[in-house]
């Protein structure tokens, strides 16, 4: 399914404290498959991969094609 990389943005929407680490929420949302179609505005966000929207954070993330890495799947994985 390729590499999953999350955009650095976390809106903090489900976090009580703005500086709270949302990693637990993110992990849980990934485990439960809490993703939706990326909004149209992010159609071209992922360069070499597909976009999905992290419901818990209301932010785009990219699932990279094989051989690509980076928040937007913009870099070739030299170790691939």
């Amino acid at each position: 399914d390729g590499n999953s990389t999350r955009s650095p943005e976390t809106n903090g929407l489900l976090c009580g404290d703005p500086e709270e680490n949302c990693a637990a929420t993110t992990t849980q949302s990934k485990r439960k498959g809490h993703f939706s179609r990326c909004p149209k505005q992010y159609k071209h966000y992922c360069i070499k991969g597909r976009c999905r929207f992290v419901v818990a954070e209301q932010t785009p993330s990219c699932v990279c094609d094989e051989g690509y890495i980076g928040a937007r799947c913009e870099r070739v994985d030299l170790f691939y």
Epitope: P8, E9, N11, G12, P18, E19, Q41, A71
Partner: antibody, heavy 116, light 106 residues
């Protein structure tokens, strides 16, 4: 606590330029998308632009495309909006807001008046 | 561009009233919708995201519903601090706001 503080507003003539700044504190600025949203006097809200955390993804409203440029300096925890070829209809309070799609924290705004 | 139309533009209500504001998108936006409250001279405050999820710290008397093109913000029992202007915002195709609904004291 999260704080966003805009500055740089003022009176400018049509066709002129202005650069707004937004100083952020109370959160890890470099992890978040940030946006500019404006509000003309007595009017509603209008999204202007957003920028991702790494400065490699930006989008603009059609009304400002080609005239405004959003940028950020993560080392200074600061967001910028360079506004060129200003028009009377750009007169508004300009807010910076945390987020790219939704805006969970806002600054107090800075007033930009474009008039001769 | 997606246009967002709110109704009514203004309404008068009393403390304790149930208030409903509607927002219609010119095309389907799934559930990519937020609601904000703004008081005079202040910045907007996020109330609801993803059409129906309550933002942290927002009182439970606020609720949102809808999907596709038709959305609703409901205040179950209006409180004195709720008199303000409310905006919907879609974030499917870029970001656009409704024109606002002013909730005034009857």
């Amino acid at each position: 606590q999260v704080q966003l503080l805009e500055s740089g507003g003022g009176l400018v003539q049509p066709g002129g330029s202005l650069r707004l700044s937004c100083a952020a504190s109370g959160f890890t600025f470099s992890r978040y998308w940030i946006s500019w949203v404006r509000q003309a006097p007595g009017k509603g809200l209008e999204w202007v632009s957003h920028i991702d955390s790494n400065s490699d993804w930006t989008s603009y409203a059609d009304s400002v495309k080609g005239r405004f440029t959003i940028s950020r300096d993560n080392s200074k925890n600061t967001l910028y909006l360079q506004m060129n070829s200003l028009r009377a209809e750009d007169t508004a309070v300009y807010y910076c807001a945390r987020g790219g799609s939704l805006f969970d924290y806002w600054g107090q705004g800075t007033l930009v008046t474009v008039s001769s | 561009d997606i246009q967002m139309t709110q109704s009514p533009s203004s309404l008068s209500a009393s403390v304790g009233d149930r208030v409903t504001i509607t927002c219609r998108a010119s095309q389907g936006i799934i559930s990519y919708l937020g609601w904000y409250q703004q008081k005079p001279g202040k910045a907007p405050k996020l109330l609801i995201y993803a059409a129906s999820s309550l933002q942290s710290g927002v009182p439970s008397r606020f609720s949102g519903s809808g999907s596709g093109t038709d959305f609703t913000l409901t205040i179950s029992s209006l409180q004195p601090e709720d008199f303000a202007t409310y905006y919907c915002q879609q974030y499917d195709a870029l970001n656009t706001f409704g024109q606002g609904t002013k909730v005034e004291i009857k």
